[in-house]
Amino acid sequence: EVEKTACPSGKKAREIDESLIFYKKWELEACVDAALLATQMDRVNAIPFTYEQLDVLKHKLDELYPQGYPESVIQHLGYLFLKMSPEDIRKWNVTSLETLKALLEVNKGHEMSPQVATLIDRFVKGRGQLDKDTLDTLTAFYPGYLCSLSPEELSSVPPSSIWAVRPQDLDTCDPRQLDVLYPKARLAFQNMNGSEYFVKIQSFLGGAPTEDLKALSQQNVSMDLATFMKLRTDAVLPLTVAEVQKLLGPHVEGLKAEERHRPVRDWILRQRQDDLDTLGLGLQG
């Protein structure tokens, strides 16, 4: 807290400009009107304030808006956003995607901080669902964002938003998350033809049931081993040797390199040796 002191004569700020960088902390507190600061927040980022000076500016805004900042101020916070705590952010009502983008830009290149996580949570909850534009924005800044959500949170993603998801966005998803996303993807891509459908659905197949894998095996899809390794164990185990051979096509030879890893190991163990021998790969059940 900065002690309340009268502003020295002639130092009262008429606008937010570079002259303020020479003000001591107590002078900023005494001479900068909080309402002026709020209306000229867009200028703050262009001025090289010290961290200590930014603390004073934040304090002034906190006093002016004890219930939380209005979006007109939030959108122009810039680097002052880095001074906010999750508790501060929980008071906000952020509805504009432009505001979200502006604040994510401040944190760009860094890990998702607790502040950013809180901001995103507030924004998504305010919207009621993860629409395509929001998902586009979030995954652009944080490719792992989708996989950081719980299965319950993912259930609010409408199938239409799935079009925004890139394969790399799903890299760190676990089976429970893919179980939620796969049916949405299936619905989103249902009107595509065979080969185009497979290209789109491929990254979601970690949530596919056995019957869908059996159906794909009839379509000459040539699934790569990396995709096969991400399939659900319970979906893979009932597949016959013939079905796996059709599903993988020329990639079936890759099973040998993965024979000690799940789910390949578990699948091999449950096949008849005679059937495995038809692959000519030397797999031992």
Partner: antibody, heavy 119, light 107 residues
Framework: QVQLQESGPGLVKPSETLSLTCTVS??????????WSWIRQPPGKGLEWIGY???????NYNPSLKSRVTISVDTSKNQFSLKLSSVTAADTAVYYC???????????WGQGTMVTVSS | DIQMTQSPSSLSASVGDRVTITCRAS??????VNWYQQKPGKAPKLLIY???SLQSGVPSRFSGSGSGTDFTLTISSLQPEDFATYYC?????????FGGGTKVEIK
């Protein structure tokens, strides 16, 4: 529900073969989803997986013990067994049998049996 | 073979504390990591499988997270019955390795 019970001698002489049996009750050793493992724990130390068997007879052993380990299954008796040859004092441990459910992990364990290797 | 390194090897905590145990795999085990609790003189008990799935009958204060090489077991509010040794284990690679264990003691 499924229960496991280890049995076998508690004292084995150095260079001899340690033999233990695990009896499965309340379920079948011929389950499609499960493999059956042996795991050991030397006094005051951590857990070491020894190996598993599937009801078909397929096995998988810890590479560090592979040359000395044999695990077998008797589906008619609903049992599986461990043989560890050429034992030394370093093989003194509590030996556990456990069910490894393919979808979860070692979800059911025997209570463990202490085996001491000493002359 | 995949090696599993647990940290810390021991920790002291009080009832009500949030406790975090980490496990690092020497190479990716994807999401295939299980967590077990063992009390003195007893067999281990499965808590978490597939990195984050809670085993049936296990209290919800236990949670797991992680994928690839870094995994975490969290006890949100430590209870008297939680003082025990915890082990991670990877079933991804056929070597089925366990971590060295983390002993959670009363402060």
């Amino acid at each position: 529900q499924v229960q496991l019970q280890e049995s076998g001698p508690g004292l084995v002489k150095p260079s001899e073969t340690l033999s233990l049996t695990c009896t499965v009750s309340g379920g079948s050793v011929s389950s499609f989803t499960d493999t059956w493992s042996w795991i050991r724990q030397p006094p005051g130390k951590g857990l070491e997986w020894i190996g598993y068997i599937y009801y078909s007879g397929s096995t998988n052993y810890n590479p560090s013990l592979k040359s000395r380990v044999t695990i077998s299954v008797d589906t008619s008796k609903n049992q599986f067994s461990l043989k560890l040859s050429s034992v030394t004092a370093a093989d003194t441990a509590v030996y556990y049998c456990a069910r490894d459910n393919v979808f979860t992990g070692f979800d059911i364990w025997g209570q463990g049996t202490m085996v001491t290797v000493s002359s | 073979d995949i090696q599993m390194t647990q940290s810390p090897s021991s920790l002291s905590a009080s009832v009500g504390d949030r406790v975090t145990i980490t496990c690092r795999a020497s190479q990716s085990s994807r999401y295939y990591v299980n967590w077990y609790q063992q009390k003195p003189g007893k067999a281990p008990k499965l808590l978490i499988y597939a990195a984050s799935s809670l085993q049936s009958g296990v209290p919800s204060r236990f949670s797991g997270s992680g994928s690839g090489t870094d995994f975490t077991l969290t006890i949100s509010s430590l209870q008297p019955e939680d003082f025990a040794t915890y082990y991670c284990q990877q079933p991804y690679d056929a070597s089925y390795t366990f971590g060295g264990g983390t002993k959670v003691e009363i402060k």
